[in-house]
Each structure stands twice: as C-alpha cells, then as structure tokens.
C-alpha cells in the first residue's frame, strides 16, 4: 500500500482511502461532536491567572469538560462498533467477491487498521489523560477559588457587620444630635425671651431716664429762667433808679425792650451793660449754636468767661473725650464749658487765661497767662500759653511747651502709663506733668499725699489737692 | 554718674532719735523727689515717705507721722531723715531713693546703699 | 493700703532656667508697678516699670506683665549674676507698698 492518505469529505467525515494495485478502499469514520480542533483558542493553562475565576464560570468548564470525556467515551465505543460491523462487513465482501489471493492483502489491511485504531485509541487514552490532568488542575484551581471566595464572604460579612456598628453609632449620634439640636431650640427661645424681657425692661429704663432729663432740663432751664429773671429785676431796678437820679428827664419813663443781641463771648455781655455775675448764653463763632457759660463780672474788672470750676466736688470729672469736647456739669457749679467752643473762640482773637485757686488753709493765689489759645480737635486740643505772671508759682505748672488734651478714652500724653486713667480726669497732660485741675476731688484732712488730687505743683506741691479752681479767659484787649 | 551716699551705720538706744543724711550728685537735686525706704532684717520694704527738695513739700506714711522729719539742704544737695522715739523694731537698713518724677512719687530709679540703724539697750 | 503677695517666696532654679515669679495685688492698681532686684549687703535696683516697660541697661532677658491685679516678672534664661531676691511695688495708691520678695537661689 504505497498510497494512504488522510483527508476530509464534503460533510465533514473523515476519510481514510487506501490504494492497493487496482483496488481501493476508502473508510469513512464518524467525526466528534464536541471535540476542539486544535486551532481553536482554547488555551488549557488560560485559566491560570493571578485573579481568581467567578466561580460559576469554573463550574461551567468543568461541566463542559465531562461532557467532552462522555463525547469522547462514546466516540471510542461508535469506533470500536462501527470497525468492528466494518471489519465484517468486509469480510463477508471479501468472502464473496475477492479472489483468493486478495485475502493476504485484506489481512494485511485489517492489520493496518487495527494498529491505526491502536494508534488511535492510545492517543484517544493520551486525550483522556490531559483531560484528567486539566481537570485535577480546574478542582486545584476551583478549591482555591472557593477558598478565596469564602476569604472574600468572609471579608464581607466583617465589613458587613463593621458597616452595621458604624449605622448604629451613626444612628445613635444623629439622636444625640437631633436631642442637642431640639435643646438648642429650647435654649435659644429662653434666651430669646430673656432679650424681650430685657429689652422691654431696658425701653422702659430709657424712658424713664428720658422723662428724668427732660425734668433736669426744666428744672436747668427754670433755673436759668429765674436766674435771667433776677436779672433783668435787677437791671430794671438799676434803670428805675438812674431814671429817678436823672432830674427833669425829658424821656419816656418807659422801659425799651431789649434788642436779642448774641454774646460770643462774656466781655461782650459785659459791654452791653450785663455787669451782674450769672449764667448767659453764648453763641459759637459764626455760627447759631448757643452754649450756656458763667460770667465773672466782677472779679478783675469782669467780663470773664468760666471754662472750668472745681469747689465741692459734687461732678465727676472723669469723662470722655466727647464730654469733654462739648461740655458737662453745672455753669453755677462745677462744671467744664467745652473744648470745642473754647478752641473756636481762642482762635478768634487773643485771650489771656487766668487760673484761680484756693487751699484748705484759706490761701489763695492765681496764675495769669497773658496769650492763651487750644488747638482744634485734629490736634487734640493742644495747650498754647505764654506770659506767666501771678502768685501760684514762677514756674507754669501747666507743662511747656502745651501739651496735647487727654482722656480716659484719648490717651495723648507723653507717659507709658495713661496719665488720665492714673490720675483721673482730663488734662493736658505731659508725663504726667504738674498739674490736674481734673483731677479727683479730695475732701480736708485727705487731701495730702494725694497725687491723684487737683494739683498745681509751683503752689502746693505733688500730694497736695486742692478746695477750689476756677479757670476763666478774656479778651487781651478787654 | 547719678549717685546717691549715705552716712554711716548707728546704733542707739530706745527712745534716742537718728538722723540719717543722703548726699545726691550727677543730676540737679532739685528737679527729683527723694523717697526713704526702710528693710527691717527678714522684713517687706517699707515707704516711709517724700520730700521735695525743690519746695521742701512732705509726705509721710501714716505710720511714721509724728516719729519722722524728712528734711533737705539744696546747698549741699543733701536730703535728712529723722526718725525719733526709737523702739527695737525700728532696727533696719534705710534707704534713701530718687522718684524718676519730680511731680509724682512714682517708682524709684536711683538708691543709696543703704544705713543700718540698730536700736538696743 | 494696698497689699503686695508675692509668689514664690523662694525659687530654686539653674542657669539657663525660666523663672517667673508672680506679685497680685489687693486692688486694682491699673499699671502703677515696679520690679526691683536686690543682692545681699546691695540696695535695690530698678529692673521694670509701669509693669512692663525696662529701665535703661537692664538685659532684656527681663520682662514684665499684667495690669490691674495681677504682675509677672520673667527671667527667659537665668544667668549666675541673676541669683538674688526680687521685689515688686506699686504706686499707683498711696502709700506705695513694696511685695516681701522672692528669692532665687541656686538649684
């Protein structure tokens, strides 16, 4: 049998022809269902991998594995049948049509086969043992699987149940939280009616304090009222008698109505003929806003205007910049006329300023400062003072050159300390200087060693605070 | 430099008076107040009280008042302090001190070193 | 009269140690407060005033706080010749008081 060739029919089967002289015999055989050929992409080792399989896919395999052996047993058994129904199918052919002669060759033929399906079926057994080793390898791999995957569940369930901790606490502190929230809101609404009460008790507070100033300004007015009253009463009585001195006056006996004339000033009031110590009312340097000042009418020649008067102590002098600014106290008492209207009126025309003082001894004396003037506000009222004369000391106890003005709340001074917080009161304070007309007031038998007290230092010294203080200005050329 | 010296240790019997100088140089006398300080052995400083050289103005601590005369020669820029009716607790080291204010007793810059009064019979 | 407690009477502390030491006062005494140094045999020195502010050629190591009430004084790196008693005063009310002093002694 010089030609034995292998090859495929149109159908798919495979064919194995033999030729032998003139005689040829073809064997068909019946092809595997379920069997891969060897260009399929299957790749045995391609389940070997560093990430486990699902595990129902390895499932799948093996279960497409079995039945591939099951195929693969079946097909063995369908060639053992059919070679073997083939064999005497042919040997009955030969039997009857062969010659005698042919038989040797059909021996030999039938040989041939049998050794083919030996052939085949030890590579049929080799098949069936990769199959076994593939397999043992996919239940390896499989048990692997499945111990990963109980690792994973069990994973799982500890992440489960952390996640479940974590829902109960986070449960338990939106409780808390929402406890907190709600007794928050009970709180806010109890402070919130607190605020009310206050604030109701407050407007109340304001009004009566309202209704207080309100009094304290009629009874200030009336006062003044009186005071004006008085006056007048007095200036009536001065005119009824120097109409009477006046023999055989021609003129109406009838008193002329007073022109409203403004007083910048009480050297104007003076001028006019007001020559009685009071309260009067001064106008701003071009301007209609009034202030209310004392005049001394009487002392060196009159005409002063009180910018400061300290005598019982009766006002606290320890007072803002604003106060200060603008005023406070009592023109008929202790009282402070304002730092603005002083300034404004200083920078009109040239002032001299003349310090009052008293002790508890019953001594006095005065300093006399020939050009006086207070710088605006954006220079903080700066002291300007030349010319000293007087008896209240050789030496100005009022720092030279002037010092800027102080306060509680406008430390301007030139100490570390704040002069005014030290010793009380505003001041044109230096480091801290001199003297403290502002300062607090002490009663007699306190008023040594007290360096917080009303001091000017060139009469009295550092501890000594003084009974009274009147400072008061005047036009130079009055 | 600014200097402050004292007069010499004392010792005296109770009931006696001391006097205690303290000569100021290196700065005008007259622009400071000068202060007296006393340490009893183991004891708190004590203030006795000021003088101001420049108007002879005092002050004394209640304490003291009646006992002591604090007193100053500007001529020689030498400020006194006499302490009378000595007891045994008067017994200390006294200081005189310079106030770094002339106008106010503040605090104290510039210290003598010191004099030891000692009061035993 | 206003009293002046110190705290601590005593400290033992090393070169190079932090030391503070405390002064409260019996009323407010706004920043009307010294500190003084004082060595044995030696009158006192004036190191800080108006509570914080050093006086001329004190080191810096040396500092002052507080108003009101109450006062510090800190060493940042005690040096040997830093070993003495310190005191501390106000004079903001008369009289002046002085504190009873502390002392800092070699550790």
């Known amino acids: 049998y010089n030609n034995f060739r292998k090859s495929m029919d149109s159908i798919g089967k495979k064919q194995y022809q033999v030729q032998h002289g003139s005689c040829s015999y073809t064997f068909l055989l019946p092809e595997m269902d379920n069997c891969r050929s060897s260009s399929s992409p299957y790749v045995s080792n391609a389940v070997q991998r560093d990430a486990p399989l699902e595990y129902d896919d390895s499932v799948q395999r093996l279960q497409v594995l079995e039945n591939i052996m099951e195929n693969n047993t079946q097909w063995l058994m369908k060639l053992e049948n059919y070679i073997q129904d083939n064999m005497k199918k042919e040997m009955v052919e030969i039997q009857q049509n062969a010659v005698q002669n042919q038989t040797a060759v059909m021996i030999e033929i039938g040989t041939n086969l049998l050794n083919q399906t030996a052939e085949q079926t030890r590579k049929l057994t080799d098949v069936e043992a990769q199959v076994l080793n593939q397999t043992t390898r996919l239940e390896l791999q499989l048990l692997e699987h499945s111990l990963s995957t109980n690792k994973l569940e069990k994973q799982i369930l500890d992440q489960t149940s952390e996640i479940n901790k974590l829902q109960d606490k986070n449960s338990f502190l939106e409780k808390k939280v929402l406890a907190m929230e709600d007794k928050h809101i009970i709180q806010l609404q109890s402070i919130k009616e607190e605020k009310d009460q206050l604030q109701v008790l407050v407007s109340k507070q304001n009004s009566i304090i309202e209704e207080l100033e309100k009094k304290i300004v009629t009874a200030t007015v009336n006062n003044s009222v009186l005071q004006k009253q008085q006056h007048d009463l007095m200036e009536t009585v001065n005119n009824l008698l120097t109409m009477m001195s006046t023999s055989n006056s021609a003129k109406d006996p009838t008193v002329a109505k007073e022109e409203q004339i403004s007083f910048r000033d009480c050297a104007e009031v003076f001028k006019s003929g007001h020559t009685t110590n009071g309260i009067y009312t001064l106008t701003f340097p071009n301007s209609t806003e009034e202030i209310k000042a004392y005049c001394d009418m009487e002392a060196g020649g009159g005409g002063w205007t009180i910018i400061q008067r300290r005598e019982d102590g009766s006002v606290d002098f320890q007072r803002t910049w604003k106060e200060y600014k603008v005023g406070f106290g009592n023109p008929s008492g202790e009282y402070w006329l304002g730092n603005e209207f002083v300034s404004q009126l200083t920078n009109q025309q040239r002032y001299v300023l003349k310090i009052h003082l008293k002790d508890w001894e019953g001594n006095e004396a005065y300093s006399l400062y020939e050009h006086f003037y207070l710088s605006s506000e954006e220079l903080n009222y700066r002291i300007h003072l030349k010319g000293l004369t007087g008896t209240a000391g050789k030496i100005s106890s009022i720092s030279q050159p002037g010092n800027d003005f102080s306060t509680k709340d406008g430390d301007n001074d030139k100490c570390i300390c704040k002069c005014s917080q030290m010793l009380t009161g505003g001041w044109w304070f230096d480091a801290c200087g001199p003297s403290n007309l502002n300062g607090m007031y002490y009663p007699q038998r306190q008023n040594t060693n007290k360096f917080n007290g009303i001091k000017w230092y060139y009469w009295k010294g550092s501890g000594y605070s003084l009974k009274a203080t009147t400072m008061m200005i005047r036009p130079a050329d009055f | 430099q600014v200097q402050l010296v004292q007069s010499g240790a004392e010792v005296k019997k109770p009931g006696a008076s001391v006097k205690v100088s303290c000569k100021a140089s290196g700065y005008s006398f007259t622009d400071y107040n000068m202060v007296w300080v006393r340490q009893a052995p183991g004891q708190c400083l004590e203030w006795m009280g000021y003088?101001?050289?420049?108007?002879?103005?005092?002050g004394y601590n209640q304490k003291f008042e009646g006992r002591v005369t604090m007193t100053t020669d500007t001529s020689t820029s030498t400020a006194y302090m006499e302490l009378r009716s000595l007891r045994s607790d008067d017994t200390a080291v006294y200081y005189c001190a310079r106030t770094r204010d002339r106008y106010d007793v503040w605090y104290f810059d510039v210290w003598g070193q010191g004099t030891l009064v000692t009061v035993s019979s | 009269d206003i009293q002046m407690t110190q705290s601590p009477s005593s400290v033992s502390a090393s070169v190079g140690d932090r030391v503070t030491i405390t002064c409260k006062a019996s009323q407010d005494v706004y920043i009307a407060v010294a500190w003084y140094q004082q060595k044995p045999g030696k009158a006192p020195k004036l190191l800080i005033y108006w509570a914080s502010t050093r006086d001329t050629g004190v080191p810096s190591r040396f500092s002052g706080s507080g108003s009101g009430t109450d006062f510090t004084l800190t060493i940042s790196s005690l040096q040997p010749e830093d070993f003495a008693t310190y005191y501390c005063?106000?004079?903001?009310?008369?009289?002046?008081?002085f504190g009873c002093g502390t002392k800092v002694e070699i550790k």
């Open positions: 003088i101001d050289p420049y108007n002879g103005g005092t």
């Open positions: 005063h106000q004079y903001s009310s008369y009289p002046p008081t």
